[in-house]
């Protein structure tokens, strides 16, 4: 039986029944989240052989070893991956061995087995005999192999049973658990699988088979599987599916997508039943079950059936996702949201053609309307009372339409109109005048050159800075006082500050008027001293930190075409002084030897500054009488140690030792420093794990079905 | 909250036509696929036709093709089905049902799980 399309196990261990008569799981099998430990000896599912995307385990208390559970699963296909992974085992808190002592092939991705504290039989296991590459494999986290004292069938009694392969340049016996050994073919066989008695099977076999040189016995398909038996290419008049098998058209004439809630129906192409055209393709008429190329970008016409369509949140630009061309209206009026400019960028960024008109209107959120980042053309076919096709109203942080260096927008028929948009200089509209053709259509109401640009510094001078001080937490800053033609319009200044690891932000940068991510506002009144330079003290800071500064002038004064005069300094960037190192992380200590410890730890996850040595301290302690009555010689685990805590000092210093020749009566060697690349590498893993974890939670942790 | 609610059924001699309409409100209705299914007594419910929103393309049951068309209207929000050359097993429920998204994977455009919103259902009765 095939099950499918994707078997989610979840919170319960009984719904493990729903396995029962699988012998091919089309799709993914996740088993995760079940926080009680259950006994899960009684389930047993010999019949699941084939995985045909990933298995993913996740958190399942209890659970020891997954050889009972699927004692004869041979082969995980990767069609689709989990981040790049066929195999994830991620914080199985009681998994003691993999035991999947049956697999055999792992067609396509990777293996991540992480974080899991108890889990041994790792090293034992030759990766290179399943997949075809294990450099992608991340296997880390898991118990330490010192402590697992993994042994293969037949070891203990000097009578093994398992065949030995070199990994790492190890030479050794190779098994799943203590008495499973891993299967390998005889070396006649090649690249082809074999049965338990070592006969070589069928080419077109994957995995194992049941007799040899049969293409009906195989038990999973190295290509495709029709009609019981495992072909090379699927035969006339069927097509590939789900990577694995060949179906009829009546098949895929008559399936859906279960993601989407529309009924759009599969298609057939280059002799593959898939769920779309791929890109580049597009649905030859709508009652079309085949594609035909695009003319250039593949076009994608929405309709709106109330004729405009209103974007008031990221859920309805979602509507637009992917359109080309937009038959209606767009009204735009977003008063909130998170992160909201890159997200209707991904929505609405496709959007070449609007057949009707635009119209933002109480659009507080935006600062840019950017995010329209193919807009090329308004029809204008239908307009607003007044014959406006761009209608532009009370924004009132929109500082920019587009960069109209490279942008080329055309207005084919109707006006623009522009009112109470504070921040957005009439200079601003005058260049989209000229750029989208529509200069000479506007009467002299439509672009209102007293409410727009009211409240931007259009026209601005440079406030320089006079002197920078830092502290660990503090930064004081001084600049030149501004003195506009009329000192009393001078009102106040404004410092704009945030943390900047990196010279490349902008005065705009984050600024989508909601954003948790914007700059940090202070003002500052004038000094009451005339002569005195203006100055603030910028505090709460963190340690060994880039900030940028910028200072803006808050004035009155007007020029002759109603505008402020303002003033605002270029972007400084200033770095706060290093201060004390938080803790050093994931302190570990082994004895090595009978007169020596190694103890490892982590850098501080806040250095604050350049680290230059470490400072260790230890001291003895009575030895622990547990540790006469464990017997060494069994396979249970072994006591973890306790960590030193000490007394006496070390100074170990983290910049380069001196170089001193190794050898003679030197005595052991230091480590190398590591190097700039491996520091790099370090920092790029972290990050890696961090974005993995991420991934894995975001994808399986959902909201209850209602 | 969503609503469909069927009308047009009633009693038909064989060979006759009925058009059955489905009212939807409370959902985005030219964004949704829909279809119809129907049960006749002491039988399992079986799908009948069904229609994608965005091209419009449609799907038949083998019993039905060249008898049944399925069509339908964004701007009225609702769903048809024009039934003609009417039979006595044609005779059961009609029900009307909207598409949800349904995890991962695909299914078949008759299987109820692939629906997430269901009408009361009208009366078809084929009878002389």
């Known amino acids: 039986e095939i099950c499918g399309p994707g078997i989610d196990i979840r919170n319960d261990y009984q719904q493990l029944k729903r396995l029962e008569n699988c012998t091919v799981i089309e799709g993914y099998l996740h088993i995760l989240l079940i926080s009680k430990a259950e006994d899960y000896r009684s389930y047993r599912f010999p019949k699941l052989t084939v995985i045909t995307e990933y298995l993913l385990l996740f958190r399942v208390a209890g659970l020891e070893s997954l050889g009972d559970l699927f004692p004869n699963l041979t082969v995980i296909r990767g069609w689709k991956l989990f981040y790049n992974y066929a195999l994830v085992i991620f914080e199985m808190t009681n998994l003691k061995d993999i035991g999947l002592y049956n697999l055999r092939n792992i067609t396509r991705g990777a293996i991540r087995i992480e974080k899991n504290a108890d889990l041994c039989y790792l090293s034992t296991v030759d990766w290179s005999l399943i997949l075809d590459a294990v450099s992608n494999n991340y296997i880390v986290g898991n118990k330490p192999p010192k402590e697992c004292g993994d042994l293969c069938p037949g070891t203990m009694e000097e009578k093994p049973m398992c065949e030995k392969t070199t990994i790492n340049n190890e030479y050794n016996y190779r098994c799943w658990t203590t008495n499973r050994c891993q299967k390998m073919c005889p070396s006649t066989c090649g690249k082809r699988a074999c049965t338990e008695n070592n006969e070589c099977c069928h080419p077109e076999c994957l995995g194992s088979c049941s007799a040899p040189d049969n293409d009906t016995a195989c038990v999973a398909c190295r290509h495709y599987y029709y009609a019981g038996v495992c072909v090379p290419a699927c035969p006339p008049n069927t097509y590939r599916f789900e990577g694995w098998r060949c179906v009829d058209r009546d098949f895929c004439a008559n399936i859906l997508s279960a993601e989407s809630s529309d009924s759009e129906g599969f298609v057939i192409h280059d002799g593959e039943c898939m769920q779309e055209c791929p890109s580049g393709f597009i649905r030859n008429g709508s009652q079309s079950m085949y594609c035909i190329p695009c003319e250039g970008p593949c076009p994608k016409v929405c309709e709106e059936e109330k004729k405009t369509k209103t974007i008031d949140s990221v859920t309805s630009a979602q509507m637009l996702q992917g359109c080309t061309i937009f038959k209606g209206n767009l009204l735009i009026n977003i008063r909130r949201g998170n992160n909201i400019a890159s997200e209707l960028e991904n929505f609405m960024g496709l959007i070449e053609v609007v057949t009707g008109y635009v119209k933002i209107r109480h659009s507080h959120a935006l600062v840019s309307l950017s995010f329209l980042k193919n807009l090329r053309l308004i029809l204008g076919e239908e307009q607003l009372e007044g014959n406006y096709s761009f209608y532009v109203l009370d924004n009132q942080n929109l500082q920019q339409l587009w960069d109209w260096d490279h942008r080329n927008l055309t207005i084919k028929a109707g006006k623009m109109y522009f009112a109470f948009n504070p921040k957005l200089c009439v200079s601003e509209i005058y260049r989209m005048e000229e750029v989208t053709g529509t200069k000479g259509r506007q009467s002299k109401g439509d672009i209102n050159t007293r409410n727009n640009g009211e409240r931007a510094s259009c026209e601005s001078d440079v406030l320089h800075f006079t002197s920078t001080t830092t502290s660990k937490n503090r930064i004081i800053i001084t600049w030149h006082r501004y003195r506009p033609p009329d000192y009393r319009d001078l009102i106040s200044f404004t410092v704009y500050y945030k943390e900047a690891p990196f010279k490349n932000v902008t005065e705009y940068d984050g600024q989508d008027a909601c954003g948790s991510n914007s700059w940090n506002m202070v003002d500052v009144d004038l000094p009451p001293n005339k002569d005195v330079e203006p100055g603030i003290l910028l505090h709460g800071l963190k340690p060994w930190t880039q900030y940028a500064v910028y200072v803006k002038a808050v004035t009155l004064t007007m020029v002759e075409n109603d505008h402020i005069r303002g003033a605002k300094s270029e972007i400084l960037y200033i770095r706060t002084n290093a201060s004390v190192p938080s803790i050093p992380l994931d302190v570990l200590s082994a004895s090595n030897s009978s007169s020596q410890l190694i103890v490892k730890w982590n850098p501080p996850s806040l250095p604050n500054g350049n680290l230059s040595y470490y400072i260790v301290r230890w001291q003895r302690q009575p030895q622990d009488g547990y540790l006469y009555r464990h017997n060494y010689c069994s396979k249970d685990k072994i006591p973890i140690r306790k960590y030193a805590d000490g007394t006496i000092d070390i100074e170990e210093v983290t910049e380069n030792p001196k170089t001193e020749v190794c050898g003679g009566e030197k005595g052991p060697c230091c480590a190398c420093p590591k190097t700039e690349a491996e520091k790099q590498a370090e920092k790029e893993e972290a990050e890696y794990r961090k974005v993995f974890e991420n991934f894995l939670h975001n994808s399986i942790f959902v909201p209850r079905p209602e | 909250e969503v609503q469909l609610v069927e009308s047009g059924g009633g009693l038909v001699q064989p060979g006759g036509s009925l058009r059955l309409s489905c009212a939807a409100s409370?959902?985005?209705?030219?964004?949704?696929?829909m279809a119809w299914f129907r049960q006749a007594p002491g039988k399992e419910r079986e799908g009948v036709s069904a229609?994608?929103?965005?091209?419009?393309?449609?799907y038949y049951a083998d019993s039905v093709k060249g008898r049944f068309t399925i069509s339908r209207d964004n701007s009225k929000n609702t769903l048809y089905l024009q039934m003609n050359s009417l039979r006595a097993e044609d005779t059961a429920v009609y029900y009307c049902?909207?598409?949800?998204?349904?995890?991962?994977?695909?299914?078949?455009?008759?299987?109820?799980?692939?629906?997430?919103?269901w009408g009361q259902g009208t009366l078809v009765t084929v009878s002389s």
């Open positions: 229609i994608s929103a965005s091209s419009g393309r449609t």
């Open positions: 049902a909207v598409r949800s998204k349904n995890g991962a994977g695909y299914g078949f455009w008759y299987e109820a799980r692939l629906y997430g919103y």
């Open positions: 409370g959902l985005t209705f030219g964004t949704f696929g």
